[in-house]
């Protein structure tokens, strides 16, 4: 008699999972000689650890602990990109700007960026078929708490000017909602932050709107004010053309003076 | 007085090749970024290409592929290489320039405009 099974609303975890997990470890810690001491294996087993066999709706902070643990790597606190909703450019920003890291380029954020999982209660199964929706279903589901965990401690490692890309294509620019405004933005630490400094990203071609004085932007500034961090704005009008400058700095069209 | 002089203009028919040319003076032309427009009879103009100080270069989707563009900056004087012309490609072309202080990835406006060289590509 087959088992009855929890129908969740969103996708079930990405195929071949645990080998994807393990073959990216690898790679990272080949391509990366700082995390060359690090054992896939028992990444593998610490990931796993926190969700098989768990309540995919009764996830918590403490689970990826050891995980956590395992996967402590040190980047430079002044050298933090974060991002909302506009991953692919910064994720090509910091594959040419090798010296600044998005939560991506860290070794946690590599192996589960764009990656679903979830397990079942009282069964080592990973459920393949679907697994919890944030918002229709419960946001202690192993995927969020993740990433919440992760964000967290990248932005309370950051230091000095700390940079954000927002998507300036966006209704909300700045979204409290998401991981950025709900919890880095919130765990930035003043004493080692003096500014964060907000990259906005225009889509449209022809948009020559200064993106910086949109409420959202205001609301941001005026959240990161209060917790005495100093906040400034920039608009990037062309990403292509942006990205062009941090490939060849050296070209005065880069460095001028508006 | 800055002045942007083009020349290279004609007549050609479809499937060929022109090569149009931008001279300078008047400004330090390996400062500045350097763009082409055109502009079809009852047509708004339009950016063509633009090229930045040291080379690097952006165009429109519509002749990606056809046309590049180029500059000389000991020469002063920036290039438009168009091959593979289309009757659609009839326009009149300008060079033009911005302020001294533009930045590639910013919001800039050109200033400096060349008088025009008509383009026709006869099908």
């Known amino acids: 008699v087959p088992r009855w099974r929890q129908q969740w609303s969103g996708p079930g975890t990405t195929k071949r999972f645990p080998e994807t997990v393990l073959a990216r470890c690898v790679k990272y810690t080949e391509i990366h000689p700082e995390m060359r001491h690090v054992d896939c294996q028992s990444v593998w087993d610490a990931f796993k650890g926190a969700f098989i066999s768990k309540h995919p709706c009764n996830i918590t902070e403490e689970d990826y602990q050891p995980l956590m643990k395992l996967g402590t790597q040190t980047v430079p606190c002044n050298k933090i990109l974060l991002w909302s909703r506009i991953k692919d450019l910064a994720h090509q920003f910091t594959q040419v700007q090798r010296d600044m890291f998005t939560l991506e380029d860290t070794l946690l954020g590599y192996l589960a960026d764009d990656l679903t999982w979830c397990g079942e209660f009282n069964t080592s199964k990973i459920n393949y078929q679907s697994c919890p929706d944030w918002r229709k279903d419960c946001s202690n589901n192993p995927v969020s708490v993740f990433w919440k965990t992760v964000s967290r401690r990248f932005a309370e490692a950051a230091c000095d000017v700390v940079h954000v890309m927002l998507n300036g294509s966006r209704s909300k620019i700045f979204d409290k909602n998401s991981t950025f405004g709900s919890v880095e933005v919130h765990n930035l630490q003043p004493e080692k932050v003096q500014t964060l400094e907000a990259w906005v990203i225009h889509g449209g071609r022809e948009d020559s709107r200064d993106l910086c004085q949109d409420p959202t932007i205001k609301e941001l500034e005026s959240i990161i004010s209060k917790r005495n961090i100093q906040f400034s704005c920039k608009n990037i009008y062309r990403p292509d053309k942006f990205l062009q400058c941090v490939k060849n700095p050296e070209d005065s069209s880069c460095t001028s003076e508006i | 007085e800055v002045q942007l002089v083009e020349s290279g203009g004609g007549l050609v028919q479809a499937g060929g090749s022109l090569r149009l040319s931008c001279a300078a003076s008047?400004?330090?032309?390996?400062?500045?970024?350097m763009g082409w427009f055109r502009q079809a009879p009852g047509e708004e103009r339009e950016l063509v290409a633009e090229?930045?100080?040291?080379?690097?270069?952006s165009y429109a989707d519509s002749v990606k592929g056809r046309f590049t563009i180029s500059r000389d900056n000991a020469k002063k004087t920036g290039y438009l290489q168009m091959n593979s012309l289309k009757p659609e490609d009839t326009a009149v072309y300008y060079c033009?320039?911005?302020?001294?202080?533009?930045?590639?990835?910013?919001?800039?406006?050109?200033?400096?405009w060349g008088q025009g060289t008509q383009v026709t590509v006869s099908s």
């Open positions: 033009a320039a911005p302020e001294r202080g533009s930045i590639w990835y910013s919001r800039y406006e050109y200033k400096y």
């Open positions: 008047g400004l330090t032309f390996s400062s500045y970024i």
């Open positions: 090229i930045s100080s040291g080379g690097m270069t």
